[in-house]
Interface confidence: medium
């Protein structure tokens, strides 16, 4: 079975002038997951990004996040890069606190 | 081995367009973002623009916004810049480099060897 | 926009001796996520640029180990411990902070 998931992209203020913006994909199936910040449409360097364990969310399913620090302004140059089961997505940095995409495939 | 070819360059009239394109090979060149600088004869180098791997990001000096068009083709390994109202400051060499800013060697590690737009009258 | 300024403009260099160019900028290059996006390049005569150092300290591929680059949020340093003649050429730092990305004006290696 596959089960797509549900991405889920925050915002919080880390200190003066940054924030730090954190993806998170829940609900799916298999394990198997590719989830990264871009800048500028380019995946980030591994040392830019903190990244969650894939555990199990009690339902059969995953879920699992990553998160990077970015200047307040430069919201706009970075989207969060989902790949899951030869699907893949992207998600922006809500100009609010929260946003939530479903996939749909 | 990384080559960059440009071509497209020449003389061309104020007012004039030209179009370069940069060949691409020894490199999976959908992978990459890349950018165009060029250099004025006995000058310093300028950033042009800059285009994402899927193309998705563009971004331009304001000295050629709104005149240079940057695309690329990833089937051809191709990145192109077409230049509208040219100017005589924008005689250059123009040069395409890879943009690996997250990769390796990081920014701009590969450059072509450039080809010469004259703009005169 | 970021303002690039370096010095010395030209630097003579006798072989074997060290040289350093410095390079500023107008506002820090210290990204949140403590990367530093300063970059230096050098062009040969009548060739293309080639990367030597890339977020500010880190030696770039094939570059020898003579090089190296350290400094701040807005003041660069660029060192070559034991000038070769093969080292002539001008020298440019660039930020890679924020669009639009801007060089230094260059500073230009010369052999005694």
């Known amino acids: 079975r596959r089960v797509p998931p549900m991405v889920n992209v925050t915002r919080s203020e880390a200190s003066e002038g940054n924030i730090t913006v954190t993806c998170r994909a829940s609900s799916f199936y298999p394990r198997n997951i590719t989830l990264t910040w871009r800048q500028d449409g380019v995946s980030l360097s591994h040392d830019t990004q903190q990244w969650g364990d894939v555990l199990p969310d009690g339902n059969g399913t995953y879920q699992t996040w990553v998160a990077t620090r970015i200047c307040q302004g430069e919201e706009q140059r970075f989207t969060c890069y989902m790949e899951h089961s030869g699907n893949h997505s992207t998600h922006p940095v809500p100009s609010g606190k929260v946003l939530v995409l479903q996939s749909h495939w | 081995q990384v080559q960059l070819v440009e071509s497209g360059g020449g003389l061309v009239k104020p007012g004039g367009s030209l179009r370069l394109s940069c060949a691409a090979s020894?490199?999976?060149?959908?992978?990459?973002?890349m950018s165009w600088i060029r250099q004025a004869p006995g000058k310093g180098l300028e950033w042009v623009s800059y285009i994402s791997p899927g193309g998705d990001y563009i971004y331009y000096a304001d000295s050629v916004k709104g005149r240079f068009t940057i695309s690329r083709d990833n089937a051809k390994n191709s990145l192109y810049l077409q230049m509208n109202s040219l100017r005589a400051e924008d005689t250059a060499v123009y040069y395409c480099?890879?943009?690996?800013?997250?990769?390796?060697?990081?920014?701009?590690?590969?450059w072509g060897q450039g080809t010469l737009v004259t703009v005169s009258s | 926009d970021i303002v690039m300024t370096q010095s010395p403009l030209s630097l003579p260099v006798t072989p074997g001796e060290p040289a350093s160019i410095s390079c500023r900028s107008s506002?820090?290059?210290?990204?949140?996520?403590?990367?530093?996006?300063l970059y230096w390049f050098l062009q040969k005569p009548g060739q293309s640029p080639q990367i030597l150092i890339y977020r500010m300290s880190n030696l770039a591929s094939g570059v020898p180990d003579r090089f190296s680059g350290s400094g701040s949020g807005t003041a660069f340093t660029l060192k070559i411990s034991r000038v070769e003649a093969e080292d002539v050429g001008v020298y440019y730092c660039m930020q890679h902070l924020e669009y639009p990305f801007t060089f230094g004006p260059g500073t230009k290696l010369e052999i005694k």
């Open positions: 506002k820090s290059l210290l990204h949140s996520n403590l990367n530093t996006y």
């Open positions: 020894g490199f999976t060149f959908s992978n990459y973002a």
């Open positions: 480099t890879t943009d690996r800013r997250h990769y390796g060697s990081y920014a701009m590690d590969y």
